[in-house]
């Protein structure tokens, strides 16, 4: 590296550092589609933002390749459970890549929150948090899925959310 | 940007990068006030530290504006529950800003942990973790609240904590 | 600092910034030893990687001193529980340092997941997530322990994992 080249790289790095990719997307009334697709998210209002990442149909889309800490929390709750006490919830972060036809599991949790309800009429609340570092290439996408999404409770964007930042 | 200006900015960035704001505060005997206020935290002893952030009456105070990953974990537990299976715990991170009179919800979880206590053995444990990226201006504060705080178990600073770092 | 010295530091920082230490280790069939030792992890296959950190017998080993956000998730589950409904699980991140003979607790969670199993359906799932910022010196190690590890469920590296990155 000559000093000029190094200088250019440093200038570029400083500028890119100013926009270290980060995003925080929040739950909204439209998040739960019931279509079997991923959860959808608010990207602009309230606490939601995108910086150096983009969004498409529920997915955070990577612009700059690198290692990202990705995270999601979902607020679960209900009055009783659709499958009774045996109901299991799977909450996961999945990657979509142009190089592979199917979604790839990245981070996944399974919970049985309904054991907290003791009868059909019992109100219960639970929460699932996931976070971890994964490598993402430009153009790859990350989505959140919850099965059974009927048990996800949305309110004001503070209880269910999805985000990422480059590390 | 002239090269001299860029140089100064780079030097400044290098120096500020050395103190990328971060903090980790730990639970202590004095954390639970019972006054309806936020939880209080240890800032110096053991694993606790402040770097580029300050602390005031339970709050992490932002010195440098930017996007921060903020997090908190609380250890919950008890022998039975004050409201039985109906007992709900709300654990949240809230923002205080000079521009608005009321605290703003940032990240919140609700749990019904008391279903974990069973017929004879009334002892139960649960944990709540929150983390997410939010934008904070200089002078803004973040606090942790737990309702019902009677269900928070403190011991040695490893089970209940509160932290942040700039992303 | 003369400009040459500053220049060298900036060049060095740029290069080291390219390898900001980070790692994500995943659960594997060999993770649970039953020996009373820490959990073991996959470091290369699938989603697992090491960048600027090394690995030894279950431990992430720090090469470069600094503040690290460390995290772990474990997937818990079972059919009934070995100690009945009163079973408690402790999931923790612990530090090993050459300066002290015993492991130091960093971040710990206790849960009573078996209250989620009920009389008729004894199958249950639960998850425990830990994350927080700690200071680590070069040569220090971080490990994950779960007591009772019989309740940890491994599958494909997405449900139980361990990672860190410098902040």
């Amino acid at each position: 590296d000559g000093p000029a080249g190094s200088w250019e790289q440093l200038i570029q790095e400083r500028r890119s550092h100013e926009v270290n990719p980060a995003a925080h997307l929040t739950g909204a009334n439209s998040s739960l589609t019931g279509s079997g697709g991923p959860l959808l998210w608010e990207t602009q209002l309230g606490l939601a933002f995108l910086r150096g990442l983009s969004y498409h149909d529920g997915a955070l889309v990577v612009t700059k390749a690198g290692y990202y800490y990705i995270y999601s929390k979902v607020q679960l709750g209900g009055v009783g459970c659709p499958l009774g006490l045996a109901s299991t919830i799977t909450h996961g972060l999945y990657k979509r890549t142009p190089r592979y036809p199917e979604e790839l599991e990245l981070l996944v949790s399974q919970q049985s929150p309904c054991g907290r309800a003791t009868s059909s009429s019992r109100v219960w609340w639970d929460s699932s948090f996931l976070g971890g570092v994964v490598h993402l290439e430009a153009g790859e996408e990350v989505v959140v899925r919850v099965l059974d999404e009927r048990l996800v409770r949305l309110r004001d964007g503070t209880r269910s959310y999805f985000g990422a930042f480059m590390v | 940007d002239g090269p001299a200006g860029s140089w100064e900015q780079l030097i400044q960035e290098r120096r500020s990068h050395e103190v990328n704001p971060a903090a980790h505060l730990t639970g202590a005997n004095s954390s639970l006030t019972g006054s309806g206020g936020p939880l209080l935290w240890e800032t110096q002893l053991g694993l606790a530290f402040l770097r580029g952030l300050s602390y005031h009456d339970g709050a992490l105070v932002v010195t440098k504006a930017g996007y921060y990953y903020i997090y908190s974990k609380v250890q919950l537990g008890g022998v039975g529950c004050p409201l039985g299976l109906a007992s709900t715990i709300t654990h949240g991170l809230y923002k205080r800003t000079p521009r608005y009179p009321e605290e703003l919800e940032l990240l919140v979880s609700q749990q019904s942990p008391c279903g974990r206590a069973t017929s004879s053995s009334r002892v139960w444990w649960d944990s709540s973790f929150l983390g997410g990226v939010v934008h904070l201006e200089a002078g803004e504060e973040v606090v942790v609240r737990v309702l019902d705080e009677r269900l928070v178990r403190l011991r040695d600073g490893t089970r209940s904590y509160f932290g942040a770092f700039m992303v | 600092d003369g400009p040459a010295g500053s220049w060298e530091q900036l060049i060095q920082e740029r290069r080291s910034h390219e390898v900001n230490p980070a790692a994500h280790l995943t659960g594997a069939n060999s993770s649970l030893t039953g020996s009373g030792g820490p959990l073991l992890w996959e470091t290369q296959l699938g989603l697992a990687f090491l960048r600027g950190l090394s690995y030894h017998d279950g431990a992430l080993v720090v090469t470069k001193a600094g503040y690290y956000y460390i995290y772990s998730k474990v997937q818990l589950g079972g059919v009934g529980c070995p100690l009945g409904l009163a079973s408690t699980i402790t999931h923790g991140l612990y530090k090993r340092t050459p300066r002290y003979p015993e492991e130091l607790e960093l971040l710990v969670s206790q849960q009573s997941p078996c209250g989620r199993a009920t009389s008729s359906s004894r199958v249950w799932w639960d998850s425990s997530f830990l994350g927080g910022v700690v200071h680590l010196e070069a040569g220090e190690e971080v490990v994950v322990r779960v007591l009772d590890e019989r309740l940890v469920r491994l599958r494909d590296g997405t449900r139980s994992y361990f990672g860190a990155f410098m902040v």
Epitope: - | P82, L83, G84 | -
Partner: antibody, heavy 119, light 111 residues
């Protein structure tokens, strides 16, 4: 001030049922557990179980399961204890005891209701 | 169930003297560094009165001459200087596990 006022003494025949009331005042009724404890002549105190007024959820001492029933009327801040299939050894003073703020002790008690079971 | 055993069954002490009452549980009543043990006083014709909760915490309105100590399975109630109104029956009670159980009582009488 906190007060728990119980119904008056009862005399019952073996096999009958008795229903004792406990009316609470001076605090937020649904925020505290209510326990039932009895004391038989020459015996010690015996915990019968608890009710959570907020939900009506109950926990019974196995010894009284199937015979004791606790209910709540939130509109009048009253809890009830009904004991069926009475026998002579059920002769006792029955107390309601409020769960304390930290809920695992009983900080206020009713004055007691004497139930006599005799043929 | 957890069996609570109090001793002595009867304790005769003079006013102004110290009284020490013991209670043993058949298994530990501790959880997370806290003991789920309470002490009550009962006088004839009256309901029980909470004196000490969580082994050593003095209930509001109870005179400071009453104190509690112990952990695990062994507990003590101490009355530092007996007053005439302290002569009564004292019960220990565990609340770690259902059913809650009481000791058989210690009768404190005037010597």
């Amino acid at each position: 001030q906190v007060q728990l006022v119980q119904s008056g003494a009862e005399v019952k025949k073996p096999g009958a049922s008795v229903k004792v009331s406990c009316k609470a005042s001076g605090y937020t009724f649904i925020d505290h557990i209510m326990n039932w404890v009895r004391k038989a002549p020459g015996q010690g105190l015996e915990w019968m179980g608890r009710i959570y007024p907020v939900s009506g959820e109950t926990n019974y001492n196995q010894k009284f399961m199937g015979r004791a029933t606790f209910t709540v009327d939130r509109s009048t801040s009253t809890v009830y204890m009904e004991l069926s299939s009475l026998r002579s050894e059920d002769t006792a003073v029955y107390y309601c005891g409020r769960g304390s703020y930290y809920w695992n002790a009983m900080d206020y008690w009713g004055q007691g209701t004497l139930v006599t079971v005799s043929s | 169930e957890i069996v609570m055993t109090q001793s002595p069954a009867t304790l005769s002490v003079s006013p102004g003297e110290r009284a020490t009452l013991s209670c043993k549980a058949s298994q530990s009543v501790d959880f997370d560094g806290e003991s789920y043990m309470n002490w009550y006083q009962q006088k004839p014709g009256q309901p029980p009165r909470l004196l000490i909760y969580s082994a050593s915490n003095l209930e509001s309105g109870i005179p400071a001459r009453f104190s509690g100590s112990g952990s695990g399975t062994e507990f003590t109630l101490t009355i530092s200087s007996l007053q005439s109104e302290d002569f009564a029956v004292y019960y220990c009670q565990q609340s770690i596990e259902d059913p809650w159980t009481f000791g058989q009582g210690t009768k404190l009488e005037i010597k």
